[in-house]
Interface confidence: low
């Protein structure tokens, strides 16, 4: 893979003045064996509010790969397999923690970041807004 | 709040031998202003596969509070407002990163942990298994 050069401005791991800094062991304790959302279930295809999963990759972030859900339809799939626009497919969002390399490209220095990701979609009764 | 005494076995922040350890700045860069899932949307109530949100708290984890979704019904709500058992409400799960104090109660030492949380529910067409 691409080797990103070390940023000369990276703080020393032992810098006590690094603000609100803690030591984090990256040997992840993983309680889950299945990390690919497409394999974990086929709900994205079987749902009445189906979604596609998009790969979002960023080498400056840990985890570098995040899967983002995008609803396939504005409406929901009815019993006949057609899109029913009386209902709405909406993304279910989750706020997650990621580690952002800061300063950029530093191998041993990160900042915690909260990002909002769409995990999947659900079918809801709509609140009707007029398109202005 | 409760002050947890410092564990005398906590590693020193400057310990170079701490395995695969990085510095993490806990001044979170938060792109999202709304952190209460109940306030961010009312999808959990309006969904055809509604869910309840349960507060899961653990002072040894960061974030200490995680909201877990539990589907209200086995089936989905139909147009008449009744539960239709020809469809299934299922949880949408997301693998998230948390920080676990390690050793316990240490203020400056964590291990990354991946946990699976249920974010919300979606309505799916069931896979019918024949009883052999």
């Amino acid at each position: 893979g691409i080797t990103i050069p070390r940023n000369p401005g990276c703080p020393n791991s032992e810098d006590k003045n690094f603000p609100r800094t803690v030591m984090v062991n990256l040997n992840i304790h993983n309680r889950n064996t299945n990390t690919n959302p497409k394999r974990s279930s086929d709900y994205y295809n079987r749902s009445t509010s189906p979604w596609n999963l998009h790969r979002n990759e960023d080498p400056e972030r840990y985890p570098s790969v995040i899967w983002e859900a995008k609803c396939r339809h504005l409406g929901c799939i009815n019993a006949d397999g057609n899109v029913d626009y009386h209902m709405n497919s909406v993304p279910i969002q989750q706020e997650i923690l990621v580690l952002r390399r800061e300063p950029p490209h530093c191998p041993n220095s990160f900042r915690l970041e909260k990002i909002l990701v769409s995990v999947g979609c659900t079918c809801v009764t709509p609140i009707v807004h007029h398109v202005a | 709040g409760i002050t947890i005494p410092r564990n005398p076995g906590c590693p020193n922040s400057e310990d170079k031998n701490f395995p695969r350890t990085v510095m993490v700045n806990l001044n979170i860069h938060n792109r999202n202003t709304n952190t209460n899932p109940k306030r961010s949307s009312d999808y959990y109530n309006r969904s055809t596969s509604p869910w309840n949100l349960h507060r899961n708290e653990d002072p040894e984890r960061y974030p200490s509070v995680i909201w877990e979704a539990k589907c209200r019904h086995l089936g989905c709500i139909n147009a008449d407002g009744n539960v239709d058992y020809h469809m299934n409400s299922v949880p949408i799960q997301q693998e998230i990163l948390v920080l676990r104090r390690e050793p316990p109660h240490c203020p400056n030492s964590f291990r990354l942990e991946k946990i699976l949380v249920s974010v919300g529910c979606t309505c799916v067409t069931p896979i019918v298994h024949h009883v052999a």
Partner: antibody, heavy 118, light 110 residues
Framework: EVQLLESGGGLVQPGGSLRLSCAAS????????MSWVRQAPGKGLEWVSA????????YYADSVKGRFTISRDNSKNTLYLQMNSLRAEDTAVYYC???????????WGQGTMVTVSS | NFMLTQPHSVSESPGKTVTISCTRS????????VQWYQQRPGSAPTIVIF?????PSGVPDRFSGSIDSSSNSASLTISRLKTEDEADYYC?????????FGGGTKLTVL
């Protein structure tokens, strides 16, 4: 009522930079993906870039990838487009748009003119 | 990237019906929504059809949209034409990471 007001356009030399802003009002800004679409004089519409409601995901047309950066400040209800290494072919009216869903521009601003010329 | 092809121009008399076509070069049109935008001279575009055939409130029912999967094309039909319908019309669709507009069709109401 949904209102989108673009600003920041003007005349710039090739290779120069410009930052467009789009002030939004009349809706919950952070709940909507936003897009920039441009229109060269006498030509058709061309999608430029889009950003998710949280700002976590961004998308670019191949013609601007690596030169333009879309961003948003949800606390200020403002969308931005940072344009670097500008070329003559970037000359256009730039519209910001509120997306109904990904790829569906429901409401549009009135546009701001960007002219790249020496 | 795929392309969306529209006729350069169409013309029809007031009171008549006109149809503007939009053909997708690759990728199934049925998998992604098609939108139609109207742009009058000197004004910003406005959406007249979204999600293939949905009409925003305020858009007359004279405007309708449809898709034909067999020809991988979409159509905008305007019935009972009025002089105020004279404008440029753009179809638009998308895929996983980009949004594409058709080249535009100039509608002249004779």
């Amino acid at each position: 009522e949904v209102q989108l007001l673009e600003s920041g356009g003007g005349l710039v030399q090739p290779g120069g930079s410009l930052r467009l802003s789009c002030a939004a009002s009349g809706f919950t800004f952070s709940s909507y993906a936003m897009s920039w679409v441009r229109q060269a004089p006498g030509k058709g519409l061309e999608w430029v870039s889009a950003i998710s409601g949280s700002g976590g995901s961004t998308y670019y047309a191949d013609s601007v990838k690596g030169r333009f950066t879309i961003s948003r400040d949800n606390s200020k209800n403002t969308l931005y487009l940072q344009m670097n290494s500008l070329r003559a072919e970037d000359t256009a009216v730039y519209y910001c748009a509120r997306d109904l869903i990904w790829g569906v521009a429901g409401s549009w601003g009135q546009g701001t003119m960007v002219t790249v010329s020496s | 990237n795929f392309m969306l092809t529209q006729p350069h121009s169409v013309s029809e008399s007031p009171g008549k019906t006109v149809t503007i076509s939009c053909t997708r070069s690759s990728g199934s049109l049925a998998n992604y929504y098609v939108q139609w935008y109207q742009q009058r001279p000197g004004s910003a575009p406005t959406i007249v059809i979204f999600a293939n055939n949905q009409r925003p409130s305020g858009v007359p029912d004279r405007f309708s949209g449809s898709i034909d999967s067999s020809s991988n094309s979409a159509s905008l039909t305007i019935s009972r034409l009025k002089t105020e319908d004279e404008a440029d019309y753009y179809c638009q669709s998308y895929d996983d990471s980009s949004v594409v507009f058709g080249g535009g069709t100039k509608l002249t109401v004779l």
